[in-house]
């Protein structure tokens, strides 16, 4: 069958019936339903919440929703037991306590099972001892202090600023300073935007907010006890003791009027520099310990939450491809919140949720996709993407043979300034193609595309006229697909402006203030920018569900691959006498880039020439179109990170959220100037190199003609 | 200096209704969350409403809501509120008051202003 | 709603007197608590925000301590101005409610 005899309709007319019938009233009617209480992963709320959505999909039109449930570790507070911070004075009496728990926002103060504030995943402890200020905990302010400075923190209790980098990653480089404990807090520098008020009056994080979060270092796992497979009914699951990615010291989170308390004292060290110092009333002094007349205070944590293996459930429904079922587009979210969700994540499930019911209308009216198009809301994503993976690990040789694209849709807005898009070269110019056709919703765009305004606000710094597109890290459901499985993958919100907001994240994220009315009143009263996301992700969805040909462009993976290039050599290059000493040469990688470069190019000819009508012909270039993604993937994955398996672009080591190019090569070359054995290091630069020029070589080859 | 200075007590028949009014001056008004807060003959405070910076949020004692209606005019610095069918119950002495956010302290008072709901 | 307990409701104290007055919250509020000072006739006045903090010209002889759920109001050294009633308040979610107050009255 050709594409037309899948359907009713025309090609274009299709996707212009299929955008028509998304409309932001239903949007925001989603969103306020999925937004009145809280729907915590593993929770009974969660589960109701699921067969809902399990029941609406099938009302909407998809041929089957299924629940597919697994028993994960997860990680909760100790109800009679709260966790918090004190300062305890000589006698061991605690003279100040945090706070158990953010005052509810007007309208949710009989609202139960909100959970306190905490670190999922925290081990229990109550270690007490002198503070050190870390700034943001990255592994260059580790390296000022221990380097630079000659602060030891060792045995010491750190405390962080949220923001810049992972909380997880955070963790991980405290707890390999020597760290007892961790202590999180949002400093308004970060949460709070100047000329904008607090909730409930706008959307500043007050300071009683605190941003929830797991602080796993998994790094693609899923669920600590059964990495690599699925947590079913008869998994084999490690001891605790053996579990992937779970921290080994105590951490808890706390917001700014809290931390005020902890940093007004302390004394030792001066910051190094500006950028150390937040926007407290206090001096930002590292530490170790308190000033003088305080100097016999310590700071004490109790935390007592506990890890539980608990069964969590994604919905998965499905609309049956026409021609090619065997073929899967998926359109993926996750359904868990830490509190109320209203942007995180309920509005993507809102969006995803009127996408389904689109493309349900079209069904209801006899059409169906070329291509089979799966949706799901995941669940446990806020405890480490554990719904998504465990999900992708249990079908995986289905979504490797069958996987065409992904497409995340975790919260649809950030901002409300423009578009943002991290997705693979191989979708470049279908985001640029479909946000041509879109209308922007931007003030002063009105009658232009979504194309002008995202490129006018957020323009590319390579090529002109075009607007940026990002590289796709981690920190949400895409991971398993994009760095494990290798199948190409995109997500799309509506973000704030970077150059003037230099706040990490939205203000409100992950705390009890993420509510409905935050959104309907301060982000999107009109839904607009939603409804402009669930064009973009509809969009991406219907077209490659759709498109006789799959909209990829190899020659756009061609043109980011030399860069990266470029890119990982110029870093090399800062060491050019070892490189000489050691031979280390980048000529291997340069040449298959080349290699790359002419072949996609000929690919893409041959995909302009070729008989569409021959489904033989057809189904074989869009299974090398389908298939360039898996060819990046290295089966042996990344130096101890099993699980990021893709050469190209992987989370980076130092910040779980940020996409790097050329992991590989990159993690070798980090900090080699420290290393103890440079011969060891430089050699394990040229493996990576090694690695990288064979595996663009050999996804170069699934380019070239088959015969 | 800082001053509140409510108006429009009175006595009223119970069912009838009332209009309380507060002048603020010395103080950015428009940087500050206002409240009334009543005080009955020989009682305690009780908290009747609130409105934030630009009234565009208004809260109520629960018991309240329906019969009362609080709301400003930044560009007078002025606060009122509305009293429809008043009981005997709402004789109090109404103080207006003011705070710098939703979880604040009432850091300024009115001197108040008596209402008295009698037949 | 969370309810505020003053206790006592009233006490008789001499000057120079250290007095002590305790405030409940029925459920746990942090820090976010107020104490006022009403003097007959007159409009209540700030004299402790945040548990502990003195409000600008509150004199040093009162000091306020406490979290979660129970809080204290001390006046160190009773003067003869001080004969009044004295409130807690909570902050921390709507309805902000009173304590029934506490009348200091001359022994």
């Known amino acids: 069958k050709s594409s037309n005899e899948a359907t009713n309709i025309t090609p274009k007319h299709n996707m212009k019936a299929f955008l028509d019938e998304l409309k932001a009233e239903n949007i925001k009617k989603f969103l306020y339903n999925f937004t009145q209480i809280p729907h915590l992963a593993g929770t009974e709320q969660n589960f109701q919440l699921a067969k809902q959505i399990q029941s609406q999909w099938k009302e909407f039109g998809l041929d089957s929703v299924e629940l597919a449930h697994y028993d994960v570790l997860l990680s909760y507070p100790n109800k009679t037991h709260p966790n918090y911070i004190s300062i305890i004075n000589e006698d061991g009496n605690e003279i100040f306590n945090t706070s158990l728990f953010e005052p509810p926002p007007p309208g949710y103060e009989n609202v139960s099972d909100i959970v306190p504030p905490f670190s999922a995943f925290s081990p229990q402890g109550m270690p007490e001892g002198d503070l050190v200020y870390v700034n943001y905990a990255r592994t260059e302010d580790f390296f000022k202090l221990e380097r630079d400075m000659k602060i030891n923190c060792s045995g010491k209790i750190v405390i962080a600023r949220y923001g810049k980098v992972f909380r997880g990653n955070k963790v991980k480089n405290a707890q390999l300073a020597g760290a007892k404990g961790v202590i999180l807090y949002s400093d308004p520098a970060d949460y709070f935007a100047p000329g904008v008020k607090s909730y409930p009056d706008g959307w500043n994080l007050p300071g009683g907010g605190v941003q929830r979060g797991n602080i796993l270092n998994l790094n693609g796992a899923g669920d600590p006890l059964t990495p690599g497979y699925p947590a079913n009914e008869y998994a084999y699951r490690r001891g605790i003791a053996e579990a992937v990615g779970l921290p080994s010291i105590p951490v808890h989170p706390i917001g700014y009027y809290d931390a005020q308390k902890l940093l007004e004292k302390m004394g030792g060290s001066a910051p190094p520099d500006s950028s150390w110092r937040g926007s407290l009333k206090v001096p930002y002094n590292v530490g170790p310990g308190f000033t003088g007349n305080f100097s016999t205070q310590k700071v004490k944590m109790h935390i007592h939450s506990t890890n539980e293996v608990t069964r969590i459930y994604n919905v998965i429904g499905t609309l049956r491809g026409a021609v090619e079922p065997d073929r899967y587009v998926i359109l993926g979210g996750h359904r868990d919140s830490w509190v109320f969700g209203g942007i995180d994540p309920q509005s993507g499930a809102a969006v995803v949720h009127e996408i389904v019911r689109s493309f349900g209308t079209l069904k209801k009216e006899g059409w169906r996709p070329r291509r089979t198009i799966l949706f799901a809301s995941w669940d446990a994503e806020e405890f480490g993407l554990l719904g998504s993976t465990e999900w992708a690990e249990e079908n995986s040789r289905l979504l490797q043979e069958r996987g065409v694209a992904y497409i995340n849709a975790d919260s649809s807005i950030e901002g409300n300034y423009t578009l943002r898009v991290d997705c693979t070269p191989l979708m470049y110019s279908l985001v640029h193609n479909l946000t041509k056709e879109l209308k922007s919703p931007d003030e002063g765009f009105e009658g232009k595309s979504l194309y002008e305004s995202w490129t006018k606000k957020s323009p590319s710094p390579e090529f002109s006229g075009m607007p940026r597109i990002s590289k796709l890290g981690s920190g949400n459901d895409f991971e398993v697909f994009f760095q494990r499985l290798g199948i190409a993958s995109g997500r799309a919100r509506y973000t704030k402006n970077w150059e003037t907001n230099k706040f990490s994240g939205y203000p409100l994220y992950h705390s009890v203030y993420e509510t409905y009315e935050l959104v309907e009143k301060f982000y999107d009263p009109m839904f607009k920018y939603h409804l402009t996301v669930a064009q973009v992700r509809g969009g991406m969805v219907f077209e490659l569900a759709n498109s006789i040909v799959l909209p990829f462009d190899c020659r756009d993976y061609a043109v980011v691959l030399r860069k990266y290039a470029d890119k990982i050599y110029s870093i090399s290059m800062k060491h050019p006498q070892e490189m000489k000493t050691y031979s280390v040469s980048f000529d291997s990688l340069f040449s298959a880039v080349k290699n790359f470069t002419e072949i996609a190019s000929k690919f893409s000819e041959r995909l302009q020439d070729f008989d569409k009508s021959n489904p033989i012909v057809l189904r074989m270039m869009n299974d090398q179109l389908m298939f360039l993604e898996r060819a990046f993937i290295d089966p042996l994955g990344l130096p101890d990170r099993p699980f990021y398996r893709h050469v190209i672009y992987a989370p980076s080591s130092h910040n779980k959220y940020a996409g790097e190019s050329f992991p590989g090569i990159y993690d070798a070359l980090f900090d080699i100037e420290s290393k103890v054995d440079p011969s060891k290091a430089w050699g394990e630069v040229k493996r990576q190199i090694y690695v990288a020029a064979f595996t663009v070589q050999a996804a170069a080859e699934t380019l070239s003609e088959v015969a | 200096e800082v001053q509140l200075v409510e108006s429009g007590g009175g006595l009223v028949q119970p069912g009838g209704s009332l209009r309380l009014s507060c002048a603020a001056s010395g103080f950015t008004f428009s940087d500050y969350y206002m409240a009334w807060v009543r005080q009955a003959p020989g009682k305690g405070l009780e908290w009747v409403a609130s409105?934030?910076?630009?009234?565009?949020?208004?809260y109520y004692l629960d018991s309240l809501k329906s019969r009362f209606t609080i709301s400003r005019d930044n560009a007078k610095n002025s606060l009122y509120l509305q009293m429809n069918s008043l009981r005997a119950e709402d004789t109090a002495v109404y103080y207006c008051?003011?705070?710098?956010?939703?979880?604040?302290?009432?850091?300024?008072w009115g001197q108040g202003t008596l209402v008295t709901v009698s037949s | 709603d969370i309810q505020m307990t003053q206790s006592p409701s009233s006490l008789s104290a001499s000057v120079g007197d250290r007095v002590t007055i305790t405030c409940r919250a029925s459920g746990n509020i942090h820090n976010y608590l107020a104490w006022y000072q009403q003097k007959p006739g007159k409009a209540p006045q700030l004299l402790v925000y945040?548990?502990?903090t003195l409000a600008d010209g509150v004199p040093s002889r009162f000091s306020g301590s406490g979290s979660g759920t129970d809080f204290t109001l001390t006046i160190s050294s009773l003067q003869p101005e001080d004969f009044a009633t004295y409130y807690c308040?909570?902050?921390?979610?709507?309805?902000?409610?009173f304590g029934g107050g506490t009348k200091v009255e001359i022994k």
């Open positions: 008051a003011g705070s710098d956010g939703y979880w604040a302290w009432f850091a300024y």
């Open positions: 409105i934030n910076y630009d009234g565009s949020s208004t």
């Open positions: 945040n548990a502990e």
């Open positions: 308040q909570h902050f921390w979610s709507t309805p902000p409610t």
